[in-house]
């Protein structure tokens, strides 16, 4: 079986989610993603990065925040907040450029 | 074993806007190890990205389409969607979505014929 | 935006030669986000390489994918008939996903 490719050294991250497969995992980063679906309380997420690092620079909404971070279970004790209501014109999930 | 299907109009008038959703069955939609992503295919042509969602709602768009593309998921119903406003005979394509995860765009949908015609 | 130039646009070959695929991009992109497809008429791409030289599920060892910086290569060693169709490479994982115009691999 062909070896995965290398990233670099990973780091082990803190995970809480539905869909961990144990309480960390390995990742090029740590994340911690706060949503809030319509009608729903916000739901806090924990876990690894490796894809598409641009989300972790993008603004918090009312909807959505991203949080990442480098280094060994650095997002255990992270806490989020979202945004306060955005005005009607804005809308969820907007374009993080 | 992951599957990914387009469905929507095959058939669109110019200047209105183009609508297809992506339903994923096999798999859930909300893991965070994967992006949904459409991709485009002009008749005869190569691929054109035209962007990804998160299951968080989080968007990236392809900035030569950013300002009329609209991405959208429904975690409840495991799908996400792709709305292209302002059309013209030029979006005349075959409609894509696919599965990104560490290891590329593993999972494909058929794809779906849009024509853009009056 | 990263672009990522193809070349041959049209390789002609036989089967059992070996055929080789050009891709290079217009600045150095991480071998962990490059990738290879194959497209047939009618059908989907399908991933063949994945971190510029993993094997996908399933793909034979006859492809192999190697590179760094901005060139990168796809090898197939002995061609068989089913493996005439368009490559496609892939900068994916960013905000810049790109692909390539494509190169026709044809009977010769």
């Known amino acids: 079986d062909p070896v995965k490719p290398s990233r670099g050294p990973l780091v082990t991250c803190t995970c809480e989610s539905p869909h961990c497969r144990g309480p960390t995992c390995q990742g090029a980063w740590c994340t911690v993603v706060l949503v809030r679906e319509e009608g729903r309380h916000p739901q806090e997420h924990r876990g690894c990065g490796n894809l598409h690092r641009e989300l972790c620079r993008g603004r918090p909404t009312e909807f959505v925040n991203h949080y990442c971070c480098d280094s060994h279970l650095c997002n255990r004790n992270v806490s989020l907040v979202l945004e306060a209501t955005q005005t009607p014109s804005e809308q969820p999930g907007t374009d993080s450029q | 074993q992951v599957q990914l299907q387009e469905s929507g109009p095959g058939l669109v008038k110019p200047s209105q806007t183009l609508s297809l959703t992506c339903t994923v069955s096999?798999?859930?939609?909300?893991?965070?190890?994967?992006?949904w992503n459409w991709i485009r295919q002009h008749p005869g042509k190569g691929l054109e990205w035209i962007g990804y969602i998160y299951y968080s709602g989080s968007t990236y768009y392809n900035p030569s389409l950013k300002s009329r593309v609209t991405i959208s998921v429904a975690t409840s119903k495991n799908q996400f969607s792709l709305k292209l406003s302002s059309v013209t005979a030029a979006d005349t394509a075959v409609y894509y979505c696919?599965?990104?995860?560490?290891?590329?765009?593993?999972?494909w949908g058929q794809g779906t014929l849009v024509t853009v015609s009056s | 935006e990263i672009v990522l130039t193809q070349s041959p646009g049209t390789l002609s070959l036989s089967p059992g030669e070996r055929a080789t695929l050009s891709c290079r991009a217009s600045q150095s992109v991480s071998t962990t986000y490059l990738a290879w497809y194959q497209q047939k008429p009618g059908q989907a791409p399908r991933l063949l390489i994945y971190g510029a030289s993993s094997r996908a599920t399933g793909i034979p060892d006859r492809f192999s994918g190697s590179g760094s910086g901005t060139d990168f290569t796809l090898t197939i060693s002995r061609l068989e008939p089913e493996d005439f169709a368009l490559y496609y490479c892939?900068?994916?994982?960013?905000?810049?996903?790109?692909f390539g115009q494509g190169t026709r691999l044809e009977i010769k």
């Open positions: 892939q900068h994916y994982g960013t905000s810049s996903i790109t």
């Open positions: 096999g798999g859930s939609i909300s893991s965070g190890d994967y992006y």
């Open positions: 696919a599965r990104e995860a560490t290891e590329g765009f593993d999972y």
